[in-house]
Interface confidence: medium
């Protein structure tokens, strides 16, 4: 179930997945929630005596059992991911941090009259992930009322330092407040030749687009279908970026599908989850568990309720079926996407719905009868 | 259109602009509304780009420069290229587009009448070609829809001008002996219409020609009257498929 409480002066031991810098525990919890494997986190609000670079450290963790041993540590805050917290799920982070310099790659500097104006500039710049604003009281006159737009490979600061009269915050694109616009176009049989920032395996271009939308540096994508001539690239989703923020003109390429990230959308922004169940498809990955259930929908529900499950394959092969149902393999991977997709007539596959805002359940508490 | 003049809004309400939307958007061809959900155009427009998703169809438009990302457009539901069309031969240069959603007819956007099969030998005297294409061989797409009146040329005479090509009975030629007025690049797929017995008919689909508006080189058009059966059959079979897949 949903565990939203935070534990003060507590640090989880072991289970380390990744470490990033975040300005507070709430932001750290959000980063853990949207990380494919993170279940627990520990945040250092105060730096240990000899390790000043550890302050603002957000340590993302996983555990087979869903819990880790707790140790007392002054200034540490720990908690759980909100992966199963339905209505509390949001990537939007509107808080402003006074006296903090969130560092990253400064790609633009301009004069603005207010912190709100600076945040708006960041929200409406395709590359901006976070910003720092120097107030009129900043110690260096030439930087006063300057708005620095920033980015990094992870989408989070590369370090955070306390500096008087600096104010920092995040882009509000994830709050659906960007005015950049929302390019919904999907180009069948066209490929973008721009810089790849990452690649994942996906069953179709729509999942690819959602993955791109929630990747910190993906602006557009090219997905190669199962018919693509290079076997190693079949069902591969290439996440792309460019200096200009726009793709170069697409090139005609049979069995390629291209499109844009929807991270600047206001209304059409997708949820970070994929509802569709793909029949005739098997998702490969690290096996978590196998149960026997009746139907692919029930398999998806089992995966959704199993917090570490990222995707599943339901098999209808005679040897995989018993009286109580057929085999439901619960799986996971490092990036949350299948390691490989194969086509098998007797299989159905899909994803956990743990990151959907409202998880649909087949059993409703109130039944409304149609007239 | 070479040697043409500006049209006015609603003068040719069946004319549409077929545009390809990639990173930028460009007018590629013309087309004609023949039904609420149907556009008739040239098959060669889709050579190398037979992907319905990238095409956008604009009706009720006079000036292409007024198209913005807010301008409504139609998308292709089904692209039907004549099964015998081969790029290297130029015959059967005809395609039907079924639109995703039916068009609303207005005074600026309505269909053109198709000729009947009996019109294969009709002599038309008042014919016009329209489009946003080049105004010279080495030119550029025009913003305002151009129009030009143009006389039909008998096939035997047309064949004499094109010794290297076969002018089939499924083609119709139009042009002036001295040149100067003709369709050109970007007018492809658009209409050659003639007024007969008080109404406009779609007589030809802009297809090909040696250069543009050259002396003794008429424009060659797909003769619509020769394809009436094909058009009706394709529209009918599309309707039947829709009935098969519609909910009970």
């Amino acid at each position: 179930g949903c565990l939203s409480q935070l534990y003060a002066n507590t640090f989880f031991r072991g289970g380390d997945l990744a470490a990033i810098y975040t300005p507070d525990a709430q932001h750290c919890q959000k980063m853990c929630t949207f990380h494919p494997r993170c279940l627990l986190f520990s945040f250092l609000a105060v730096s240990p005596t000899k390790e000043t670079d550890k302050r603002f450290g957000c340590f993302m963790k996983e555990s087979i059992t869903g819990t880790l041993p707790r140790i007392h540590r002054t200034g540490a805050i720990s908690g759980h991911s909100l992966k199963q917290c339905g209505h509390q799920l949001s990537a939007c982070h509107q808080d402003i941090y006074e006296g903090l310099d969130m560092r990253g790659s400064n790609f633009n500097i301009s004069k603005t009259d207010s912190i709100e104006e600076c945040q708006k500039l960041c929200t409406n710049n395709i590359h901006c992930q976070f910003f720092t604003y120097a107030t009129k009281a900043f110690h260096r006159p030439e930087y006063r009322k300057s708005c620095l737009l920033k980015r990094s490979s992870s989408g989070t600061p590369t370090s955070i330092k306390p500096v008087d009269n600096l104010v920092s915050g995040f882009s509000l694109k994830s709050c659906a407040l960007s005015e950049i616009g929302c390019p919904m176009d999907i180009f069948q049989h066209f490929a973008f030749a721009d810089l790849n920032v990452s690649h994942v395996v996906t069953p179709d271009a729509f999942v690819c687009r959602t993955v791109c939308t929630f990747h910190p540096n993906c602006l557009f994508f090219t997905f190669y279908t199962n018919e693509w001539e290079t076997e190693s690239q079949r069902n591969v989703c290439f996440l792309k970026t460019s200096k200009s923020g726009r793709p170069s003109p697409p090139i005609i390429q049979e069995n390629a599908v291209s499109g844009y990230s929807l991270f600047t959308c206001r209304k059409a922004r997708p949820e970070p989850c994929h509802f569709k169940i793909y029949s005739g498809v098997a998702f490969e990955g690290e096996e978590l568990n196998a149960t026997f259930v009746q139907g692919a929908d029930a398999c998806q529900e089992t995966c959704t309720k199993t917090i570490r499950c990222q995707f599943f394959t339901y098999s209808l092969l005679p040897q995989d079926c018993k009286a109580e149902g057929c085999k439901c393999s619960l799986r996971l991977s490092t990036d949350g996407s299948p390691t490989r997709i194969t086509y098998e007539a007797q299989g159905s596959s899909g994803y956990s719905l743990r990151l959907c805002k409202v998880v649909e359940s087949s059993d409703c508490t109130t039944k409304i009868n149609a007239r | 259109i070479v040697g043409g003049t500006n049209s006015s809004l609603g003068e040719w309400p069946w004319q549409v602009s077929l545009q390809v939307k990639l990173v930028s958007q460009n007018h590629m061809c013309g087309g004609s509304i023949i039904g609420r959900q149907w556009i008739l155009t040239a098959a060669h427009c889709f050579d190398g780009i037979p992907y319905p998703d990238v095409w956008r169809i604009y009706g009720g438009i006079l000036n292409l420069s007024e198209i913005t990302n807010k301008t409504p457009f139609s998308s292709i539901k089904e692209l039907i290229i004549h099964q015998k069309y081969k790029m290297s031969e130029g015959s059967y240069d005809i395609a039907l587009i079924k639109l995703q959603t039916p068009l609303n007819y207005t005074e600026f956007q309505k269909p053109i009448c198709l000729p009947s099969k009996a019109d294969t030998n009709t002599i038309y005297t008042n014919c016009w070609v329209t489009g946003w294409g080049y105004t010279k061989e080495r030119g550029e797409t025009q913003n305002i829809l151009q129009k030009a009146t143009i006389p039909l040329v008998p096939n035997e005479e047309c064949q004499k001008k094109y010794r290297d090509y076969v002018i089939t009975k499924q083609m119709i030629c139009a042009g002036y002996k001295e040149g100067g007025i003709d369709a050109c690049k970007g007018d492809s797929g658009g209409p050659l219409v003639c007024k007969h017995s008080g109404r406009w008919q779609l007589v030809g689909i802009t297809s090909w020609g040696e250069g543009c508006a050259r002396k003794e080189q008429p424009g060659v058009y797909t003769k619509v009257a020769e394809y009436i059966d094909w058009i009706l059959e394709k529209i009918q079979s599309s309707k039947e498929r829709a009935l098969e897949t519609s909910p009970a």
């Epitope: - | 190398g48 240069d93 090509y165 690049k185 492809s188 797929g189």
Partner: antibody
Framework: EVQLLESGGGLVQPGGSLRLSCAAS????????MIWVRQAPGKGLEWVSY????????TYADSVKGRFTISRDNSKNTLYLQMNSLRAEDTAVYYC???????????????????WGQGTLVTVSS | DIQMTQSPSSLSAFVGDRVTITCRAS??????LNWYHQKPGKAPKLLIY???RLQSGVPSRLSGSGFGTDFTLTISSLQPEDFGNYYC?????????FGGGTKVEIR
């Protein structure tokens, strides 16, 4: 299957003449434009001459104009290149090729060369 | 005459690499540009016509783009059989001119 086979190449002295032939099969020869292209040893491609399907219109590169003549015999499915007043700089492999697009579509025109022969070597040397 | 300038004149790449060759015309040529591939001792082979249209039988890892004066040939994932020389050619006006060629070697 489309096939083009050149012949008639060889060694010739400067000022001499040669006649190249290109035998075509596997397509309706009389319906296609034909082209000669040459390639000097270790160099790039150079377009030489072009002839329309009926033979009614021909064009030449400036470097060969007045010395070379392109012709065709549609009854024999053969293309020819008569080369007179040959110079050392005419030394090359000569390819015949088929013109790919017959029509000047109103939205597409490209005189591309879709099938090529294997070439015949012409050496002009004293 | 229209001059066609290709770059680079040669390149060396690994199997699986994305390779891009550019061709620039000395004056605008609309989309009247073709690309050919030639292996040593063999005749050239047509790859792409009218700037971006793939000749039938050519693998779709090859693609072309461009309009006016600047054109690009892209091989999305270089294969061993892709070595050799690549030429662009304009068909906008006679004389039809070729680029100087790009030699592609497999590392």
């Amino acid at each position: 299957e489309v096939q083009l086979l050149e012949s008639g190449g060889g060694l010739v002295q400067p000022g001499g003449s040669l006649r190249l032939s290109c035998a075509a099969s596997g397509f309706t020869f009389s319906a296609y434009s034909m082209i000669w292209v040459r390639q000097a040893p270790g160099k790039g491609l150079e377009w030489v001459s072009y002839i329309r399907p009926s033979g009614g219109r021909t064009t030449y590169a400036d470097s060969v104009k007045g010395r070379f003549t392109i012709s065709r015999d549609n009854s024999k499915n053969t293309l020819y290149l008569q080369m007179n007043s040959l110079r050392a700089e005419d030394t090359a492999v000569y390819y015949c090729a088929r013109g790919g697009l017959l029509l000047w579509f109103r939205e597409l025109k490209s005189n591309y060369f879709d099938y090529w022969g294997q070439g015949t070597l012409v050496t002009v040397s004293s | 005459d229209i001059q066609m300038t290709q770059s680079p004149s040669s390149l060396s790449a690994f199997v699986g690499d994305r390779v891009t060759i550019t061709c620039r015309a000395s004056q605008p040529i609309d989309n009247y540009l073709n690309w050919y591939h030639q292996k040593p001792g063999k005749a050239p082979k047509l790859l792409i016509y009218a700037a971006s249209r793939l000749q039938s039988g050519v693998p779709s890892r090859l693609s072309g783009s461009g309009f006016g004066t600047d054109f690009t040939l892209t091989i999305s994932s270089l294969q061993p059989e892709d070595f050799g020389n690549y030429y662009c050619q304009q068909s906008y006006t006679v004389p039809y001119t070729f680029g100087g060629g790009t030699k592609v070697e497999i590392r």
